[in-house]
């Protein structure tokens, strides 16, 4: 008879466990990389590469692994305790206000501005006015108005693990 420790204890609800006073911080909870069985008897391991859980929990199901979109590269794979980490491809970035997609970095700054920051997976190139040093955050300028520069090298994730 299996005690089902392969995907484990509490009321059947898909939710993070409430922080109530316990004799042990993990009392009645399953460890990262597991979820609770439907009958509340045991902890069951998440399936490697398919789903995960990052905290002590009483989830009925592990969380589904993120699949990197086209236009993204996989920095680290999904494990039973950590979601996939995806990053925008070189020359593209993900903005905080539009995290659902990677956007192309501008190829250069408008006239009268100089580049002070490279294209990274989480930010566009940064341009400032030559004289005042104030930042420019406008639309991508017309091609003939730009001072070209090559995109920077991606360095760290823009899609954080769950």
């Amino acid at each position: 008879e299996s005690a089902l420790i392969t995907q484990q204890d509490l009321a059947p609800q898909q939710r993070a466990a409430p922080q109530q006073k316990r004799s042990s911080p993990s009392e009645g909870l399953c460890p990262p990389g597991h979820h609770i069985s439907e009958d509340g008897r045991d902890c069951i391991s998440c399936k490697y590469g398919q789903d995960y859980s990052t905290h002590w929990n009483d989830l009925l199901f592990c969380l589904r692994c993120t699949r990197c979109d086209s236009g993204e590269v996989e920095l680290s794979p999904c494990t039973t305790t950590r979601n996939t980490v995806c990053q925008c491809e070189e020359g593209t970035f993900r903005e905080e206000d539009s995290p659902e997609m990677c956007r192309k970095c501008r190829t250069g700054c408008p006239r009268g501005m100089v580049k002070v920051g490279d294209c990274t997976p989480w930010s566009d190139i940064e341009c400032v006015h030559k004289e005042s040093g104030t930042k420019h955050s406008g639309e991508v300028p017309a091609v003939e108005e730009t001072v070209t520069s090559s995109p920077g090298t991606p360095a760290s994730p823009c899609s954080l693990s769950g």
């Epitope: 008879e1 204890d9 009645g28």
Partner: antibody, heavy 117, light 107 residues
């Protein structure tokens, strides 16, 4: 505070039935996921798991002793019981009850020594 | 049944030393392993569960590691009060099984 305490006959003769009681406090056996096991340890030897009862009265037994074991509970009185039939000198041991909830045996009783002689 | 093997029945160490007690499962048990300490004349006490999680009140000199079939309990800066028997246990599947125990002796 979680406490468990075992009680038994102390001494009994071969072929008799051993009856053990585990009285506990600090938790309820009606709580989802909660369970109590019986574990024994012959003097100077290792630990042997015998049986487990869950909050919903589901029971598990060690297959090597299953035909001789019966575990039961009285939730309202906070007690769990174990019966072992046809005892032999090999059943001489300290018997422990321990609480389990989704993992290990986090709380143990002090144990009760049973001698079959 | 899953057999839990503690290859060393006895281990000798000195106060202040670091000692590692090993346990091997006969089949994959994931991280569903606990370690217990039993001092002479006392009942077992939970030290480590889910292979590496320290139980409430257990000193941080006790560390658990491993997954699958190989598990280790490490005691760093051994103290005289650590003289005891140490048992591993799997709760991956019924019947739950314990290792034969390792008696830690202090020189």
């Amino acid at each position: 505070q979680v406490t468990l305490k075992e009680s038994g006959p102390g001494i009994l003769q071969p072929s008799q039935t051993l009856s053990l009681t585990c009285s506990f406090s600090g938790f309820s056996l009606s709580t989802s996921g909660m369970g109590v096991s019986w574990i024994r340890q012959p003097s100077g030897k290792g630990l042997e798991w015998l049986a487990h009862i869950y909050w919903d009265d589901d029971k598990r037994y060690n297959p090597s002793l299953k035909s001789r074991l019966t575990i039961s509970k009285d939730t309202s009185r906070n007690q769990v019981f174990l019966k072992i039939t046809s005892v032999d000198t090999a059943d001489t041991a300290t018997y422990y009850c321990a609480r389990r909830r989704l993992g290990p045996f986090a709380y143990w009783g002090q144990g009760t020594l049973v001698t079959v002689s | 049944d899953i057999v839990m093997t503690q290859s060393h029945k006895f281990m000798s160490t000195s106060v202040g030393d670091r000692v590692s007690i090993t346990c091997k499962a006969s089949q994959d048990v994931g991280t569903a392993v606990a370690w217990y300490q039993q001092k002479p004349g006392q009942s077992p006490k939970l030290l480590i569960y889910w292979a590496s999680t320290r139980h409430t009140g257990v000193p941080d000199r006790f560390t658990g590691s491993g997954s699958g079939t190989d598990f280790t309990l490490t005691i760093s800066n051994v103290q005289s009060e650590d003289l005891a028997d140490y048992f591993c246990q799997q709760y991956s599947s019924y019947p739950y099984t314990f290792g034969g125990g390792t008696k830690l002796e202090i020189k």
